[in-house]
Amino acid sequence: ELSPQPSNEVNLLDSKTIQGELGWISYPSHGWEEISGVDEHYTPIRTYQVCNVMDHSQNNWLRTNWVPRNSAQKIYVELKFTLRDCNSIPLVLGTCKETFNLYYMESDDHGVKFREHQFTKIDTIAADESFTQMDLGDRILKLNTEIREVGPVNKKGFYLAFQDVGACVALVSVRVYFKKCPFTVKNLAMFPDTVPMDSQSLVEVRGSCVNNSKEEDPPRMYCSTEGEWLVPIGKCTCNAGYEERGFICQACRPGFYKASDGAAKCAKCPPHSSTQEDGSMNCRCENNYFRAEKDPPSMACARPPSAPRNVISNINETSVILDWSWPLDTGGRKDITFNIICKKCGWNVRQCEPCSPNVRFLPRQLGLTNTTVTVTDLLAHTNYTFEIDAVNGVSELSSPPRQYAAVSITTNQAAPSPVMTIKKDRTSRNSISLSWQEPEHPNGIILDYEVKYYQKQEQETSYTILRARGTNVTISSLKPDTTYVFQIRARTAAGYGTNSRKFEFETSPDSFSISGENSHV
């Protein structure tokens, strides 16, 4: 399989990529010979070979064309070659060698004539595995790769030369390269191609943040002589509206947002909000939905609550207790409170005015968190309308109408106190006559009394109510010889008082009558 060249290597010469003849200088002319061959992948290439193994004192030179240095300070020479085992060649004992020599010469000029003595030896090259005649069937195993480094190089370019001293060798490819720290992105910072120094020191390189990001700490890295980036320091982070994807900051897609700079990912828009464009820092609320000023962008958009329900008023003289149920729709928020608007009205409900400041609300008029309020210090015999507003954190952002429930009441004096004693005047088999005294505190004109009775053994599962104008009553159609329980309460314009305690009386067993008994429970 073809192994790609590392990205940190920059070729100055690669014989495999040259189309046609290489045209290098061979001296003497019957030494190195340019031939067509194949590489380890059976790709046709131009190679140089020499196999003058019969003669002693071979000195065959092959010089490359001039190679420009570019920005390299240290260069690497990669040789791929095949070297034939001397034992596989008949007749040549003593004259055959299994090494060759690598030289170089720096030059600012590329028209230099070839002179051996101007070249500096880099190394003697020997095969890691030379191959014998029996190896020739499988070409891939015959290839040797040797790499040598040269440097520092200072002039504009250089020549390489190969000296054969009697080996049977083919140069399959010659690659000359230098190492650079390649363009890279680390921690969202871009670091440019950087050529390292020849010395052992590292080159410090300042990174620049990728698009749509900003420095968190100044990004830096060090370029080593081997063309490797080392010790990343600092970083960039994506701006609001952008998230890290691979090596870039990518805009949040429609429907997603990112509120602040940093490493967080784009988040889905919260309920009842959306974005139509890329790169959103927050999501816009849908129509009739709102976000309060101090709400974070991650909070769902909400709407005002619906009106409170099931308002009940309990009037006591010039006070009223108002109770209600929570709105069916909270609007999507938990911060619901209730405000009470108090209006004093004439006998025509449409003619109302705000209540006097003397009216008191317990625990308070505005910002109630529970569903009950007591209103006191109202005027007696007066019509009032109470509007109970349900509000939440976004109510003030929405246009009217308000969401409220209203209740109208009329104040009065207090209801009468209880009847204290009930007296049995007489009884028969089917009837009982009762009388009582007016309550101690009638609190007005008593309009009538409510008499409630039931058979004791039935435990109030079934009872009868009748009204009496005065302070006595005869109850008929009763069962003989039966105990009945009686309660009485008075009614005024203010309403019913509380019931008396329970009194028990019995009907007669026979047809005679009994009179003048009190009863105690």
Partner: antibody, heavy 121, light 106 residues
Framework: QVQLLQSGAEVKKPGASVKVPCKAS????????MSWVRQAPGQGLEWMGW????????TYAQGFTGRFVFSLDTSVSTAYLQISSLKAEDTAVYYC??????????????WGQGTLVTVSS | EIVLTQSPATLSVSPGERATLSCRAS??????LPWYQQKPGQAPRLLIY???TRPTGIPDRFSASGSGTDFTLTISRVEPEDFAVYYC????????FGQGTKVEIK
């Protein structure tokens, strides 16, 4: 231009000897081995052996020992094949051929034009 | 001694056709196997060495392959000047030639 030049045809009597020269030009004579090949009329090629032109050391193939001798005169870049006690079955064209060793394999890359030796009484 | 057997002995082809010649060794000779071409009245000429490498000047219609004991010489499109006898040769301890394959005009 690399070439091997051989002498013209020879006619010999049985029992006689013949020395066939092969003069090399256009390259360093001692840098390549020299091979000898025989081809009887209407037959295929037969490798006779070779000589190391650097050391003068010969190698003979089976069937070509005894009466066949390879020799050199490096001063005139010439290789010789001498056959003694000629027999009728020695009648053939004799080729000298330069041996080429390469990394990928060997072969005889330059041939003389051949010398026809006829043995007839 | 290694014996090389070439087949067929004679191959009749028309110009422009493909010709495939076979050479089989009695034991493995790896890839050190050259091929030669010999025209009537001429010395042989080296066509291929190392089983598949062409010397300078040999047309690329000649190609060869194989290793071990089985080798093939292929002429992709036979030209008039290609009618000749073709020999394979092995380089063992002692060198030997095959008996040759004659390529003639059909």
């Amino acid at each position: 231009q690399v070439q091997l030049l051989q002498s013209g045809a020879e006619v010999k009597k049985p029992g006689a000897s013949v020395k066939v020269p092969c003069k090399a030009s256009g390259y360093t004579f001692t840098s390549r081995a020299m091979s000898w090949v025989r081809q009887a009329p209407g037959q295929g090629l037969e490798w006779m052996g070779w000589i190391n032109t650097n050391t003068g050391n010969p190698t003979y193939a089976q069937g070509f020992t005894g009466r066949f001798v390879f020799s050199l005169d490096t001063s005139v870049s010439t290789a010789y094949l001498q056959i003694s006690s000629l027999k009728a079955e020695d009648t053939a064209v004799y080729y000298c051929a330069r041996v080429r060793f390469t990394v990928y394999g060997d072969g005889m890359d330059v041939w003389g034009q051949g010398t026809l030796v006829t043995v007839s009484s | 001694e290694i014996v090389l057997t070439q087949s067929p002995a004679t191959l009749s082809v028309s110009p422009g056709e493909r010709a495939t010649l076979s050479c089989r060794a009695s034991q493995s000779v790896s890839s050190n196997l050259p091929w030669y071409q010999q025209k009537p009245g001429q010395a042989p000429r080296l066509l291929i060495y190392g089983a598949s490498t062409r010397p300078t000047g040999i047309p690329d219609r000649f190609s060869a392959s194989g290793s071990g004991t089985d080798f093939t010489l292929t002429i992709s499109r036979v030209e008039p000047e290609d009618f000749a006898v073709y020999y394979c040769q092995q380089y063992g301890p002692s060198w030997t030639f095959g008996q040759g394959t004659k390529v003639e005009i059909k």
